[in-house]
């Protein structure tokens, strides 16, 4: 999936299987990613587990679990708030669109989480205070906390290089992260579809094009669109909302 | 102890919140106060040793005398806004200050710096 880190780095990650997205003193978020097509290096999120840890007199430990075709509007125990403590309503789930869009507000840690199902796969977005982001007991053990550190170098897909290949008249399939590139989606069509929803040619737009070329699944247009919309709602600095290509940096060195 | 449920139902029922009601709203406000008093009385067995209960009881007494409400009279059906659905067994409502990040952690400093992380697509 595409990852926008807390430090506004944008990466496309292979990261197959279960990976920690957030892991701090208050919250643990784990995602499970599966290949979008057989044999593909590109993966998308098929499962999401959020654990809100027991916190003072506010909330009991609560677990939220979403999977493909199952986006609950309640925690695993059936409740919609933080339990039985006096501050239980400082953690709340709101169903925005049944089976498609859920918002979780954790006021006790100033955090808002948006989970969506777009097409077959899940998207995740969070707004969190820096103080909470950095609330980790052991800084050294937080190496694979994707939202903070980004993906490891060996787990990244260079989609800018992929795009260069895609723009050339003959697209060598071997250079693609997916050996099964659907010929039904020419580059120009992908560009047109993405431009329709994402008029600014930023990295969300680039991600959209990449996803359409990789999968031929038009739902990924919506995934990029909603990711940007959620960013609009959740990003505190509106000037940093649109990310554009940078000169190549050392990926994985995001801290 | 469900005293906080009583509190939230009362503040939901009196849309003017803690402000004094207009004179023509007083009967309705008194009815809401009586409902609040009944609710707190019902929590006495399980809340009587807790601060929240005593604060509510004293608050009701003060408001009753301020608005010349009689102890007997009609009660109101609260217009509940943000309580969990009936099927949900968790019934606590109002939050202590520590359960509101901006209020508690940043009482004496600037607003927190927020960060954003997102994961989508393939």
């Amino acid at each position: 999936p595409h990852l926008r880190t807390f430090t506004d780095h944008f990466q496309t990650c292979k990261v197959q299987g279960a990976w920690p997205l957030i892991d701090n003193n208050y919250l643990n978020v784990q995602v499970t990613n599966t290949p979008v097509l057989p044999g593909s290096a590109a993966t998308a999120t098929s499962k999401l587990t959020i654990i809100f840890k027991n916190f003072q007199e506010c909330v009991d430990q609560k677990v939220y679990q979403a999977e493909m075709d199952e986006l609950p509007s309640a925690f695993a125990d059936g409740s919609k708030n933080g339990g039985d403590k006096h501050g239980a309503n400082s953690l709340k789930i709101t169903e925005k669109v049944s089976g498609q869009h859920v918002e979780i507000q954790a006021k006790y840690i100033g955090t808002t989480i948006v989970v969506r199902q777009v097409g077959r796969y899940l998207t995740f977005a969070v707004r969190m205070p820096e103080e909470v982001v950095n609330a980790v007991e052991d800084r050294d053990s937080q190496g694979l906390y994707l939202c903070l550190r980004g993906c490891p170098l060996n787990q990244q897909i260079d989609f800018q290089a992929f795009r260069a290949n895609a723009e050339s008249p003959r697209r060598p399939a071997a250079a693609s992260p997916s050996p099964v590139v659907p010929e039904t989606f020419p580059y120009e069509t992908a560009v047109a579809k993405c431009k329709e929803k994402l008029p600014v040619e930023d990295l969300y737009y680039q991600a959209c094009v990449f996803d359409l070329l990789t999968t031929g699944d038009v739902n990924f247009t919506l995934a990029a669109y909603y990711a940007l919309e959620d960013g609009k709602m959740l990003h505190s600095n509106k000037d940093k909302l649109h990310l554009f290509e940078r000169t190549r940096e050392l990926p994985g060195a995001v801290a | 102890c469900k005293i906080l449920k009583c509190n939230s139902e009362f503040w939901s029922a009196t849309s003017s919140g803690s402000h004094a009601p207009a004179s023509d709203d007083v009967p309705e406000f008194c009815a809401a106060l009586r409902t609040y008093a009944l609710c707190t009385r019902r929590t006495a067995r399980t809340c009587r040793g807790d601060l929240a209960y005593h604060s509510a009881v004293h608050g009701i007494e003060d408001l009753m005398s301020q608005h010349n409400c009689s102890k007997d009279g009609p009660t109101s059906q609260p217009r509940v806004r943000t309580l969990p659905p009936a099927g949900d067994s968790q019934e606590r409502s109002d939050s202590p200050e520590i359960c509101h990040y901006e209020k508690s952690f940043h009482k004496h400093s600037a607003a927190p710096n927020y960060t954003h992380c997102g994961l989508f697509g393939d």
Partner: antibody
Framework: EVQLVESGGGLVQPGGSLRLSCAAS????????MNWIRQAPGKGLEWIGM????????HYADSVKGRFTISRDNSKNTLYLQMNSLRAEDTAVYYC????????WGQGTMVTVSS | DVVLTQSPLSLPVTLGQPASISCRSS???????????LEWFQQRPGQSPRLLIY???TRFSGVPDRFSGSGSGTDFTLKISRVEAEDVGVYYC?????????FGQGTKLEIK
Amino acid sequence: EVQLVESGGGLVQPGGSLRLSCAASGFTFSNYGMNWIRQAPGKGLEWIGMIYYDSSEKHYADSVKGRFTISRDNSKNTLYLQMNSLRAEDTAVYYCAKGTTPDYWGQGTMVTVSS
Amino acid sequence: DVVLTQSPLSLPVTLGQPASISCRSSQSLETSDGDTFLEWFQQRPGQSPRLLIYEVSTRFSGVPDRFSGSGSGTDFTLKISRVEAEDVGVYYCFQVTHDPMTFGQGTKLEIK
């Protein structure tokens, strides 16, 4: 996370005294009534008494009335149980528990009254 | 004082099967406002008691939904829909309606 840690238990002779403490954390101690409950070895639970958040009222079971005193120090987040004129039948694990009605309990401290 | 009588005192159950514990009160636990303050606690071997159910039927936070409480007046029941190994222990009913608060004598649940 609500935590209650009892201490002060031990062996005491009949007629002797003992003071148990219960250190509270993870919640606003001064907002809540608190309880003491005991459990004799191999037996059931017995409620001993409770104290209001501000110590304004205390309630006791008949079996300990006049011998046991519950107190609290909100500045130290600590609940106490002063036990005087102890009898063999007071031998038990003593638990403190949060709330007017107990929801969270400590791990208990053992009191043995024996000569 | 209100006496709570539990039955059975010992309850052997097969894993995955339901279990039911009864608690009878010597007087009604319903208040004049219609509320009933009866709770259920679980005490696993070597552990402190843990609140399961309050006000007859409301599950406490984190309690699995296989536990349910019912009843009114003087007769109350705790049901476990499918017993799991971790459910082994002693279960107590507890009344708060009348002073002093009192516990039932306990029901020991064990696996057959």
